[in-house]
Amino acid sequence: KSSNLEGRTKSVIRQTGSSAEITCDLAEGSTGYIHWYLHQEGKAPQRLLYYDSYTSSVVLESGISPGKYDTYGSTRKNLRMILRNLIENDSGVYYCATWDG
């Protein structure tokens, strides 16, 4: 089942070529696998990657560029994703999600 993640919807505006950081606040007891999705207007949401907090590893969805995203846990209750070298095509709503069992 889906778990709630304590998220505050934020708007971030950045210049082309810069980086952006997105924070995901994890609910108590969240699983060690956290997924990142991108939803762009007129498209279905697509999973970009997931983070395995047990091994500190990232698994990229097929077709996702390595080096574009960096995600890591800064605390037990907080996960951050950095988007590098931004271009207009990166615009959209980014979600984090996790599942129990």
Epitope: S57, V58, P66, R84, N85, I87
Partner: antibody, heavy 122, light 108 residues
């Protein structure tokens, strides 16, 4: 001179694991990402994953998720790529390649190891 | 995201110039100036020939040059020589496939 020297060729049976090493010299090991790329016979280059300079995090291609593990030993300036549950389609030359930028990867690979041929056959 | 597309083969005579294309999208080749090119001789490891679209590493002949227009990057080899016969791969930041499909260059 910057150099990456890989371990010798290996022959493995289906279902087994293989661990390939890549020893770096001539530069500050903990300043660069390392990538692993494979090439099946007669085929193109296929990116597998990367490990960050400190060895604290890794990124894997989905295709290899759950089967590949990248590690590094900073004391010996050596990277390792372990691939488990081998099948015949894993027969390939495996390369390590240094990301030539510092910390923020900016996508160019230089130098490359000489390659390690892994043959999976029953 | 689709792969970076290269012609399967190109050929030229000694002394001629040839161009190898690498076509991507606005999310990879068109979006960044981070295209690199690699030469691979049979049985050998790839070698970096061009980085950041048009920069040549030291030790690489100035017969090799790179450029980009829109979503397509190009590698041009002038004054073709027998030792240029090899496979060539492009790579672009932003590409899910990381590497292009590869081009076999034959020197006639």
């Amino acid at each position: 001179e910057v150099q990456l020297v890989q371990s010798e060729a290996e022959v493995k049976k289906p279902g087994a694991s293989v661990k390939v090493s890549c020893k770096a010299s001539g530069y500050t090991f903990t300043r660069h990402y390392m990538h692993w790329v494979r090439q099946a016979p007669g085929q193109g280059l296929e990116w597998m994953g990367l490990i960050n300079p400190s060895g604290s995090s890794t990124v894997y291609a989905q295709k290899f998720q759950g089967r590949v593990t990248l590690t590094r030993d900073t004391s010996t300036s050596t990277d390792y790529m372990e691939l488990s549950s081998l099948r015949s389609e894993d027969t390939a030359v495996y390369y390590c390649a240094r990301d030539n930028s510092h910390l923020d990867q900016v996508w160019w690979f230089d130098p490359w190891g000489q390659g390690t041929l892994v043959t999976v056959s029953s | 995201q689709s792969a970076l597309t290269q012609p399967a083969s190109v050929s030229g005579s000694p002394g001629q110039s040839i161009t190898i294309s690498c076509t991507g999208t606005s999310s990879d080749v068109g979006g960044y100036n981070y295209v690199s090119w690699y030469q691979q001789h049979p049985g050998k490891a790839p070698k970096l020939m061009i980085y950041d679209v048009s920069n040549r590493p030291s030790g690489v002949s100035n017969r090799f040059s790179g450029s980009k227009s829109g979503n397509t990057a190009s590698l041009t080899i002038s004054g073709l020589q027998a030792e240029d016969e090899a496979d060539y791969y492009c790579s672009s930041y932003g590409s899910g496939s990381v590497f292009g499909t590869g081009t076999k260059l034959t020197v006639l």
